[in-house]
Every structure is written in structure tokens, then in C-alpha cells.
């Protein structure tokens, strides 16, 4: 049913979702921080383009009886009792903030008439692309796909002179919701890695991977997984690996590669590090880049909502247009506007556009380097370390099919 | 000696592309952190690209999207793609080091300098 929303008279409020389920296992106070930390530098910046009107934050919690196995699992139905929540209490604000699980996402989507824009920290699946009033400010797996067939079939660098066109996956059903959605993606049979690839496997269990990387008969030398170092290393251990396997870690939201006393232990010299780059600007905003660890990213996309909605809220006043309207709920997309880090760029479908970067390990220095870095907004690699100290053989990554000659 | 050497400038038209150079001798480009620079005339000198010495390229907004740097430790050089030239970007271009305290920032100063390399950006 149609429910009205608090969002005119020069007062404009913004709902924001607190579920028990969450994408990340971040307290729900520092989400509430980092919204409230949004909401501060919005009204400075509506203050200084002479708009004098006020922005709020209702803050919806779930009463967690139910749905309480705080991960995503029991996230759908949760998502659509904020919904119902809301709407008893005639309390919609001009946008939704949260959810950031998949399921809760698709299926509030799929059971509301939105006539509103929905932000979420998340919504990581191919199940949520494409979708006229989301926006959704974290890497989803349309991104991740999009950068590992590029690079799979990049040939034509001084450290890959081959396509590949083989993998293996590792997924065994531990992931965190991101990771399970990006494998999901990959795993997918209808999905544009699987139609591009000729080869590919999901390993299932630590036993299947673990005997791919000595095993003469594998079909593929490069292994695809998602998690930290220490992930890699529970499943890995110090086992001997065949001097061509080539891992790729898939580890988008982790900062730890970018601390300056990082050594890179001795199991990751096979291993190529998929990652965000912690920052693209030259220049330091007025306002600190130093957020605390426990705003990285996740409640960092929150703030960037608030945010993102400021610059939305700002362009629509100035232009005397009407907020509670199809036009405004169809306008978050494919636009830069000024995060708290720096600009942000969503593409044509709402989704946050990002500089992945791609490390290796230096057999010299036994630090993490920058091999390559890829651009969502463009889907272009730009490689960056031409002679890469590699512990491949001539310093080039190997062919994806052992014993395959050159293409 | 420590010493920089550009080259690569020249006379481009709008829309069109080149490719500076940057080589050091007398230390290792891997160590350091480097940076682009350029002098438009009558104008202050503005940081371009930052490459930190872990290799992580950090962009001023106005050439995001169109410069790309890389580096070759190999031949001790580095390079400056710059694409979808402009008028505004004509400018004498300088590239800098400065031995890293951080492998993962742009250093507040550098300390060694090259000469400079002419681009020009016309019709």
C-alpha cells in the first residue's frame, strides 16, 4: 500500500533500516555514528548552498525475536517487517537506507510498489543488479565478474602473455556474505565469467583444493577464492603448490595489505591479491580521511548514503523540483558526488563504481606490490609494475593449462 | 649521481595522446616514491600523479580517468600515459622522487627533481 512519506515542507527524512541480519557484523551504534556523522556534513553543505531546510534520521530497529541468526541467512522476511513497521506507522522517510543482505533486498524490492530510492551497504548478488530504484555504494559481484574476464583475457603485458580461459572456484559454504555472493556469482552457469570461460570447477571441499595443487592432471593452474590471508593459509597451510598454480585471493574490503609494516608471509608468494585501493585522491579533503577501522567500508557506505541523498536532496531544491516523486526515486544513478573519502561515481544502474587493485608478492622485498589496477567505471586494466619480481618463472604468469603453448 | 631525466614531450593535438618518460640513475625507482608535476605558464607548479613506492597510483581529479602511470624497474624508469589531451593540460612536466617513509602514500616533499619535458596541447 502506498504510505506517505515525511519529506516535504522543507523538512526531509531519511529511514534508515537497523536489522538484526547484516551483511557485515558491524554494532549497529557505529552505523548509527556513521549516519549521524552524514547527516552533520549534509546540513553544512545545504546551509552553504542557502538551503535553509531540515534533515533527520528515523532509525527502524528489528525486534530481533525472530529473525535473529544476525548473519543473512533469516534476512528476507526481516527486511519486509521493517517494511510493514514503517508502514503502520505512516513513518517512510524520502529514502530507505539498509538493507545490506541480498535476500532481504531482492525480496523487498520484489514485494513493494517503491516509489522511493533504496541505499544499501551490500546487496552484494547478481539478483540485485539492475534494479531502477537501488543504489547500491559496495562493489557487487557484477563488478568482481566483469574485472576477472578482463583479465583473464588480457594477453598482452610484459607479465601476461597469455589468455586464460580455465579456473578453478573454491567455495565450501563458510563465506562471509560478501565473498558467498561474489563466488555465487562465479559459480553461476548463466553468469557472463561462466559464459566466457571454457573451463570451470567449483572445489567444494578443503580436500579437493588441496590435492588440486600438486595434482599433474588438474585442468586448470588458476584457482579462484575469496577471504584473508589467514583464510588462504587454514585451508593452504605450508603445503607444497606446483610451481604454476596462480591463486587469486579475493579480498575486496580488507585495508591490511596497505599498512606500511606489512611482510607478506611465505604462503602468499603464489597468491595475487584482489583488493579496493584505499584512497585514489592526491589531495586530502578539508574534512579527515583517517576514519577508524570500525568505519571502513561498511559503515562508510552508510555515511556515503546520507550523503548521497544530501547531493540528490541539494540538485532537486535548487531545481525546484518535487522529492516525493518517480523522477527523484529514479535519479540515483550515473553521478559523481562528494563522499566523505573522496568523489563517488555510480554507474548507469546504481552501483558504485571503484579502482581495484591487483598485489603481488616481491620474491625480494617479501612485501605486497601494486601489479595492476582496473577500473570499474570503464572496465580498463592499467597495469603498473611492467617488471614485476614474481615467483613465476621469468618473472610472467603462467599459462592457465599446463604445457600449452603461447596464443 | 641522483638524476631524472624526462622525454616524451612535444606538440599534440586536442583529443590526442602521448607518452612521457622519466629515467633515474643513481638510485632505484623501486625505493622511492615518484611523482608528476606540471607548470602551465604563469601558473603554480600542481601535483599530476602520485606512484608510492609500493605502486599505488594516487591521481589528481583533474587527469583521473585519462593519465595512467606505470613503472619498469627493469630499465629504472617510469612512465606518464597521458590520454584525451586538453588544451588546459599544455604545461612544462616535471617528474620528482622522494625516498618512501611510507610505501603506501604520496610524500609531502620530494627531493630530487628532473628538468622538465615541454607538452603542448593545440590545434
Known amino acids: 500500500s502506498q504510505v506517505s512519506q515525511n519529506c516535504h515542507n522543507g523538512s526531509y527524512e531519511i529511514s534508515v533500516l537497523m536489522m538484526g541480519n547484516s551483511a557485515f557484523a558491524e554494532p549497529l551504534k557505529n552505523l548509527e555514528d556513521a549516519v549521524n556523522e552524514g547527516l552533520e556534513i549534509v546540513r553544512g553543505r545545504l546551509q552553504n548552498a542557502g538551503l535553509n531546510v531540515t534533515v533527520n534520521a528515523t532509525f527502524m530497529y528489528s525486534d530481533g525475536l525472530i529473525h535473529n541468526s544476525g548473519d543473512c541467512r533469516s534476512s528476507t522476511c526481516e527486511g519486509l517487517d521493517l517494511l510493514r513497521k514503517i508502514s503502520n506507522a505512516q513513518r517512510m522517510g524520502c529514502v530507505l537506507i539498509g538493507p545490506s543482505c541480498t535476500y532481504s533486498t531482492f525480496q523487498m524490492y520484489l514485494d513493494t510498489e517503491l516509489s522511493y530510492p533504496m541505499i544499501s551497504a551490500g546487496s552484494f548478488g547478481l539478483s540485485c543488479d539492475y534494479k531502477e530504484t537501488l543504489t547500491r555504494l559496495m562493489s557487487p559481484a557484477r563488478k568482481l565478474m566483469y574485472f576477472l574476464v578482463n583479465f583473464w583475457k588480457t594477453n598482452d603485458l610484459p607479465f601476461k602473455t597469455y589468455s586464460w580461459s580455465t579456473s578453478y572456484v573454491y567455495k565450501n559454504g563458510t563465506e562471509t556474505e560478501d565473498c558467498f555472493w561474489y563466488l555465487n556469482a562465479l559459480e553461476a552457469s548463466v553468469s557472463y565469467f561462466s559464459h566466457e570461460l571454457g573451463f570451470k570447477v567449483v572445489l567444494r571441499q578443503d580436500k579437493e583444493f588441496q590435492d588440486i595443487l600438486m595434482d599433474h592432471n588438474r585442468k586448470s593452474n588458476v584457482i579462484i577464492m575469496c577471504g584473508g590471508p589467514e583464510f588462504l593459509y587454514k585451508l593452504k597451510g605450508d603445503r607444497a603448490v606446483a610451481e604454476d598454480i596462480v591463486i587469486i585471493l579475493v579480498d575486496l574490503f580488507n585495508d591490511q595489505y596497505f599498512e606500511d609494516n606489512v611482510t607478506a608471509p611465505d604462503y602468499m608468494k603464489n597468491v595475487l591479491v584482489l583488493t579496493l585501493s584505499p584512497g585514489n585522491s592526491l589531495l586530502n579533503s578539508s574534512f579527515s580521511r583517517n576514519l577508524s577501522p570500525t568505519k571502513r567500508d561498511f559503515a562508510l557506505a552508510y555515511l556515503n548514503g546520507i550523503l548521497l541523498f544530501g547531493h540528490m536532496l541539494k540538485i532537486f531544491l535548487e531545481n525546484g523540483e518535487n522529492i516525493t516523486t518517480p523522477k527523484f526515486a529514479h535519479a540515483f544513478r550515473n553521478l559523481t558526488f562528494e563522499g566523505y573519502d573522496g568523489p563517488v561515481t555510480l554507474d548507469d544502474w546504481g552501483d558504485v563504481d571503484s579502482t581495484m587493485v591487483l598485489l603481488y608478492t616481491s620474491v625480494d622485498t617479501k612485501k605486497y606490490k601494486v601489479l595492476l589496477t582496473y577500473d570499474t567505471h570503464v572496465n580498463k586494466t592499467y597495469p603498473v609494475d611492467m617488471s614485476p619480481t614474481f615467483t613465476w618463472k621469468n618473472s610472467k604468469l603462467p599459462n592457465d593449462i599446463t604445457g600449452r603453448g603461447p596464443q | 649521481e641522483v638524476q631524472l631525466v624526462e622525454s616524451g614531450g612535444g606538440l599534440v593535438q586536442p583529443g590526442g595522446s602521448l607518452r612521457l618518460s622519466c629515467a633515474a640513475s643513481?638510485?632505484?625507482?623501486?625505493?622511492?616514491?615518484i611523482g608528476w608535476f606540471r607548470q602551465a605558464p604563469g601558473k603554480e607548479r600542481e601535483g599530476v600523479i602520485c606512484?608510492?613506492?609500493?605502486?599505488?597510483?594516487k591521481y589528481a581529479d583533474s587527469v583521473k580517468g585519462r593519465f595512467t602511470i606505470s613503472r619498469d624497474n627493469a630499465k629504472n624508469t617510469l612512465y606518464l600515459q597521458m590520454n584525451s589531451l586538453r588544451a588546459e593540460d599544455t604545461a612544462v612536466y616535471y617528474c620528482?622522487?622522494?625516498?618512501?617513509?611510507?610505501?603506501?602514500?604520496?610524500?609531502?616533499?620530494?627531493?630530487?627533481w628532473g628538468q622538465g619535458t615541454m607538452v603542448t596541447v593545440s590545434s
Open positions: 606512484l608510492t613506492s609500493g605502486g599505488l597510483p
Open positions: 620528482a622522487a622522494s625516498g618512501a617513509t611510507s610505501r603506501w602514500n604520496c610524500p609531502p616533499q620530494y627531493d630530487h
Open positions: 643513481g638510485f632505484t625507482l623501486d625505493d622511492y616514491a
